[in-house]
């Protein structure tokens, strides 16, 4: 007896699809060995049609797949567009040859069933409406018309022209004639349910002269579309229920033992398990809509159904569409932090993974909002201006080739708490959800800028200092000027770097940035931050106002003077005279390191490790797809 198990007999009709699951014993060897599906020939040879090694035969091209689920010790063979030629004996098995462990499967594909000439077949999905056409001769034009349903030998009346309607068809069945037609009557049955399926007889007249027609009604459960998604990726359920329900509330539910539990609907209901990672988007006026779920978890696997009803809840006899979602745990999407914590006044650096093959794709960051359908307006993007309310405190740092970009948000408030999505205009599977939790700060921030009321005077020299604790000693410190297209790193000077790491003096760890001479366009937000390679850490922001020099004011900025008097060794006080010459070595003559560190151009070049742009310019706001 084979340890492989599967369906012994599979039967379907032409044009349909089948999904054949084969179960294998849970061993490491079995999980990783080749899986195959082959067709048994008369000569005893089993010809491979598809295997997990990537082989796909010509006759299966474009219509079959084999997917291994090692965590369940199963593999699934999906075959679409069946024809009668697919009828035969098959094997699903494991091993490097087709003679290893296997299970025999018989597949039978029949023609769509035919009925006697006088039987009309109506095939409808659950929830839809069927119109049964009943022909009669002129002699029965004024006779009673009826439709009955066969139950064994009896035929129970569903509706007739005397206005009788069977209670189980109440408000669902109508009998009518169209225009001036004298030889056809019609019966509409709406909100079809599975028990409506069966053989119907429509009749005009009584006795031997009566005209009768047979109608076979098939009410189909929706065939679930199979969706295979990776852990942590996203899935979109595209739901098209037809114009007749365009104005009804829409929902997506997940089937369980007794019911279908609503995950989201257009009336504002949302399952807490999907908080922050679900969006329902109307597509058009014909009732089409889509539901996007990001950050897929193992427990999200299962059967989903979308539907429409004024209550926003599943109702029998209303149209539905179905899916079966599989979540593959062998994911290409890296595991990133799902919760990031910050404190008021502080900052967070959020790493967003993206498909490394798509480093040129546009990157975005949006804030998930819990309005009735969920929405995610873009706050920042590589070609999207920073949204109002986030100026000076939000920037996106792209790191091409690294498979990740970083979003930094500072000046945090408790209102920033919530869910945010990382997304790109490329591979839609790589959408990640982060929950930001901002708590009230209980201590001073790690980075502090002085002076705190920063006003620079045009034409003068202005220095701002950023104090950092010893724990950031070994990290790279930087200043950057914030603009709508990122935060562009500036030359700066780290005063703590001179000290030995053994004797770190908490009070004198400073990274400074000097504007000389100050210009009007220097006004704006500046950030002081720390980073290690491509990994960004804490940041703090300060707004530098720029004003005209008032007559009679000294040329030296008082804050600089105070700083110099307090900090500078006496012998360095003379260096101000050579500053003009030294500045010529700078990339930007107005921005340079603190004067006490300008010893030679070599030192300066070493100090001014300015990394490239953080973000690219211009462009319109993107939207989440």
């Amino acid at each position: 007896q084979s340890p492989i198990f599967g369906p012994q007999d599979v039967s379907s009709i032409e044009g349909n699809s089948v999904s054949i699951t084969c179960y294998y014993p849970d061993t490491s060897v079995n999980r990783h060995t080749r899986k195959y599906w082959c067709r048994q020939g008369a000569n005893g040879y089993c010809a491979t049609l598809i295997s997990s090694n990537g082989y796909l035969s010509k006759e299966y091209s474009g219509r079959a797949s084999l997917i291994n689920f090692p965590e369940n010790s199963t593999f699934v063979i999906n075959i679409a567009h069946l024809t009668q030629e697919d009828t035969g004996s098959y094997k699903c098995g494991l091993g490097t040859t087709n003679r290893g462990l296997f299970f025999d499967v018989s597949l039978e594909v029949s023609q769509v069933p035919e009925f006697p000439n006088d039987t009309h077949v109506y095939t409808k999905d659950i929830g839809r409406t069927v119109t049964i056409e009943c022909r009669f001769k002129e002699g029965n034009a004024h006779s009673k018309k009826s439709l009955c349903k066969k139950r064994g030998e009896a035929c129970e009346v569903v509706i007739d022209s005397t206005e009788y309607v069977d209670p189980s068809y109440k408000d669902r069945a109508i009998l009518f004639m169209k225009g001036t037609s004298r030889d056809i009557f019609y019966v509409n049955i709406s909100h079809l349910i599975p028990s409506d399926a069966g053989l119907y007889v429509c009749q005009a007249g009584e006795g031997p002269s009566a005209d009768k027609n047979n109608a076979d009604l098939q009410v189909l459960e929706p065939e679930p579309e199979l969706l295979y998604k990776d852990l942590r990726s996203s899935v979109t359920f595209e739901c098209d229920l037809g114009r007749e329900v365009a104005n009804d509330a829409k929902y997506l539910c997940r089937k369980n033992k007794e019911t279908c539990d609503v995950i989201i609907n257009t009336l504002g209901k949302r399952d807490p398990a999907f908080e922050g990672r679900i969006l329902l988007t109307p597509r058009d006026d014909n009732g089409r809509f889509s539901v996007l779920i990001t950050g897929l978890r193992k427990e999200d696997a299962g059967h989903y159904q979308c539907g429409a009803h004024s209550s926003g809840l599943p109702q029998e006899g209303w149209p539905v569409q179905a899916w079966q979602l599989f979540v593959n745990e062998e994911s290409t999407i890296p595991n990133s932090r799902s919760v990031v914590k910050g404190v008021t006044g502080g900052s967070v650096a959020i790493v967003c993974p993206y498909n490394p093959k798509e480093s040129s794709s546009l990157k975005y960051w949006c804030h998930w909002e819990a309005d009735e359908n969920g929405r995610c307006p873009v706050l920042v993007g590589t070609q999207a201006l920073v949204q109002e309310g986030y100026e000076g405190r939000l920037a996106l740092f792209d790191q091409p080739g690294s498979g990740a970009y970083t979003v930094i948000l500072n000046q945090l408030t408790t209102q920033d708490s919530g869910f945010y999505w990382c997304l790109t205009d490329g591979d839609s599977r790589w959408r990640t959800t982060i929950e930001l939790q901002v708590a009230e700060a209980t201590k001073k921030p790690d980075l502090e800028v002085t002076p705190q009321n920063a006003t620079a005077v045009i034409g003068e020299t202005f220095t701002i200092s950023c104090h950092y604790p010893c724990k950031f000693y070994s990290q790279e410190k930087y200043w950057c000027k914030w603009s709508n297209d990122g935060c562009h790193i500036l030359p700066s000077h780290d005063e703590g770097a001179r000290q030995s790491s053994v004797s770190c003096d908490q009070s004198s760890q400073i990274v400074s940035m000097t504007l000389n001479p100050v210009k009007k366009e220097d006004e704006g937000w500046y950030w002081c931050g720390v980073k290690e390679g491509q990994v960004y850490g804490e940041t703090t922001a300060i707004y530098v106002a720029v004003e005209e020099r008032t007559r009679g004011s000294p040329h030296i900025n008082p804050t600089d003077a105070n700083a110099r008097a307090k900090d500078a060794p006496e012998e360095e006080a003379m260096e101000s005279s050579v500053r003009e010459d030294e500045n010529k070595a700078n990339l930007d003559p107005r921005l340079f390191a603190d004067e006490r560190e300008i010893q030679n151009a070599g030192d300066q070049a070493q100090e001014n490790r300015a990394s490239g742009n953080a973000g690219s310019a211009g462009g319109q706001s993107g939207s989440s797809k």
Epitope: F5, P7, Q8, D9, V10, S11, S12, I13, N16, S17, V18, S19, I20, T21, Y23, F69, N72, T74, V76, I193, P194, S195, L220, E221, P222, E223, P224, K255, N256, K257, E258, A301, G302, H303, E316, A322, Q324, F326
Partner: nanobody
């Protein structure tokens, strides 16, 4: 309330045949899969056969110990399932239980596992005499 009612059990001679039926009832109960398990005294519940359907596609599963002897089928409405038992042996003696699922399960769920079936009947006794 969903109910599964088994019938057709009884005493049968070795080599004989028996046909078990299981009818599912409940106002809107439309099962997605139905199956048969059996339990002999002092033994664990054992998978016999199952039938699962999706639209016009049907999947039939048969346990290894009854392969080639037992077949499973259902009626057109899908609310009754049958187990045709041929060439019965004394070791087929057991209480036969009907099981049903209303919800399409993840197709990776093994039908042989009793834990994954939602509804159960009360059982019908089959005794094979030698």
């Amino acid at each position: 309330e969903v109910q599964l009612v088994e019938s057709g059990g009884g005493l049968v001679q070795t080599g004989g045949s028996l046909r078990l039926s299981c009818a599912a009832s409940g106002r809107t109960f439309s099962p997605y899969a139905m199956g048969w398990f059996r339990q002999a005294p002092g033994k664990e519940r054992e998978f016999v056969a199952a039938i699962r359907w999706s639209g016009a596609t049907t999947y039939k599963y048969v346990g290894g110990s009854v392969q080639g002897r037992f077949t499973i089928s259902r009626d057109a409405a899908g609310n009754t399932v049958y187990l045709q038992m041929n060439s019965v042996k004394p070791e087929d003696t057991a209480v036969y239980y009907c099981a049903a699922d209303r919800v399409p399960k993840d197709i990776s769920i093994d039908p042989r596992n009793p834990k994954d079936w939602d509804y159960w009947g009360k059982g019908t006794q089959v005794t094979v005499s030698s």
